[in-house]
């Protein structure tokens, strides 16, 4: 091992304070005791150390805790967290939501880094499920967090956690993810009355089956076109013209602008043209009068 440089006389740090920002890297290495640093980590964030100085402080902690930092240190890492690698973080056992919040705060405003992703993974695995408080915290910092999870990971989200989800948290979710989230949302909001229920369930409807859409059409919900366009095509196809008209209410006029896009295009192809004509929107492409319409499932049975 290389012999370490001795600390110059009078420079031995008695505590972590602003005077250390004027220490050269080798002076920090020589004059700051690792145990002192560990007990006063809460001060590091209030001191504008350079990135090079933070490297030295990290090295001291790594030497003190080769098996991974204790949570008392992790909670106060502050900007030093940005120096950690995913490998470092995998050694940690983070159990406190306060610790998680403190570290997410450091990365606030930036994309989710590999370090943050590893930290979240360690935290959620440690808890066993995505409870409401955790989900609340994660979506507050990363609105797209929920949609970054696989359907398998989403299956561990308890229905009670769905209350923490905001519409923007689901913006980037694909149908497979909404298929998992929708039944949980339905369960979470089941005791709400009609209009309140629709407001809450609306963002999740991309995972709704046909029978639930039919039920909603009986409740004067006036679904907007943006929501309708996110519905599963296979769920929309069996809806009748009358049901779609009731589902959309005054927004039904928006179908004309979307007639070339799925699911509207595919739905139009399944409707009788004379039924479409009753809407008075000039929708074209329906089944001409007199043609036999076979249900898809029936066609499969026949073939």
């Amino acid at each position: 091992e290389v012999e370490k440089t001795a600390c110059p006389s009078g420079k031995k740090a008695r505590e972590i304070d602003e005077s250390l920002i004027f220490y050269k890297k080798w002076e920090l290495e020589a004059c700051v005791d690792a145990a002192l640093l560990a007990t006063q980590m809460d001060r590091v964030n209030a001191i504008p150390f350079t990135y090079e100085q933070l490297d030295v402080l990290k090295h001291k902690l790594d030497e003190l805790y080769p098996q991974g930092y204790p949570e008392s240190v992790i909670q106060h890492l502050g900007y030093l967290f940005l120096k950690m690698s995913p490998e470092d973080i995998r050694k940690w056992n983070v159990t406190s939501l306060e610790t998680l919040k403190a570290l997410l705060e450091v990365n606030k405003g930036h994309e989710m880094s590999p370090q943050v992703a590893t930290l979240i993974d360690r935290f959620v695995k440690g808890r066993g499920q995505l409870d409401k408080d955790t989900l609340d915290t994660l979506t507050a910092f990363y609105p797209g967090y929920l949609c970054s999870l696989s359907p398998e990971e989403l299956s561990s989200v308890p229905p009670s956690s769905i209350w923490a989800v905001r519409p923007q948290d689901l913006d980037t979710c694909d149908p497979r993810q909404l298929d998992v989230l929708y039944p949980k949302a339905r369960l979470a909001f089941q005791n709400m009355n009609g209009s309140e229920y629709f407001v809450k369930i609306q963002s999740f409807l991309g995972g709704a089956p046909t029978e639930d859409l039919k039920a909603l059409s009986q409740q004067n919900v006036s679904m907007d076109l943006a929501t309708f366009m996110k519905l599963r095509t296979d769920a929309v196809l069996p809806l009748t013209v009358a049901e779609v008209q009731k589902l959309l209410g005054p927004h039904v006029e928006g179908l004309k602008a979307e007639e070339r896009h799925r699911p509207v295009r595919d739905w139009i192809l399944r409707q009788r043209q004379d039924d479409l004509d009753t809407l008075g929107l000039g929708l074209q492409g329906g089944i001409p009068n007199g043609y036999l319409v076979l249900d898809l499932s029936m066609q499969e049975a026949l073939s």
């Epitope: 505590e15 304070d17 602003e18 920002i21 006063q40 001060r43 209030a46």
Partner: antibody, heavy 117, light 110 residues
């Protein structure tokens, strides 16, 4: 909410020794360096002294070195400045301030010390 | 440690931009990115507006910005408003772990 409240000012005879206090709330007092800054009537701000989180390190401006002692009681969340041998030029509003990222991020409303016979 | 040098006064009309300079030495402003700016309204405590040369504390309008070149730091206020009228002080941390202030600049909004 961070709050700093100074007290102990008033009229002091030349050569007097007032002790200023600053009661603090709203943050973890023991984790932060604290500072005293003064402002003579119509004059510049002048940094006076600072003390590190647990009181191990203290720093003074040349103008008060040897005549003032900064201290803190972390159990009471209170900062002190003991001033001795006061002169007319020490007349000023004295502010206590919290040091964050090497800047004074929160200040009290100040306490006026007037040195006059 | 001598005070940092600031112009005694600057003025500007509402909506305009103004810049206040703060000149130090190589042992304070020039050596470290530890320059702060404070706003002080008459009879009030100073308020931190900029720290570490160009960073804004939360709650401070983005009309306030800071920069540094060599031994001189600058505070720029854009879209001047009546409530910006105040005294502005710069300060720098020094290598002797002390703080040095400027003598302040009185900003008048015409």
């Amino acid at each position: 909410e961070v709050q700093l409240l100074e007290s102990g000012g008033g009229l002091v005879q030349p050569g007097g020794s007032p002790r200023l206090s600053c009661a603090v709330s709203g943050f973890t007092f023991s984790s932060y360096t604290m500072s005293w800054v003064r402002q003579a009537p119509g004059k510049c701000l002048e940094w006076v002294s600072a003390i590190s989180g647990s009181g191990g390190n203290t720093y003074y401006a040349d103008s008060v070195k040897g005549r003032s002692t900064i201290s803190r009681d972390n159990s009471r969340n209170t900062l002190y400045l003991q001033m001795n041998s006061l002169r007319a030029e020490d007349t000023a509003v004295y502010y206590c301030a919290k040091v964050g990222r090497a800047a004074l991020d929160y200040w009290g409303q100040g306490t006026l010390v007037t040195v006059s016979s | 440690q001598s005070a940092l040098t600031q112009p005694p006064s600057v003025s500007g009309s509402p909506g305009q931009s103004i810049t206040i300079s703060c000149t130090g030495t190589s042992s304070d402003v020039g050596s470290y990115n530890l320059v702060s700016w404070y706003q002080q309204h008459p009879g009030k405590a100073p308020k931190l507006m900029i720290y570490e040369v160009s960073k804004r504390p939360s709650g401070v309008s983005n009309r306030f910005s800071g920069s540094k070149s060599g031994n001189t730091a600058s505070l720029t206020i854009s879209g001047l408003q009546a409530e910006d009228e105040a005294d502005y002080y710069c300060s720098s941390y020094t290598s002797s772990s002390t703080v040095v202030f400027g003598c302040g600049t009185k900003l008048t909004v015409l």
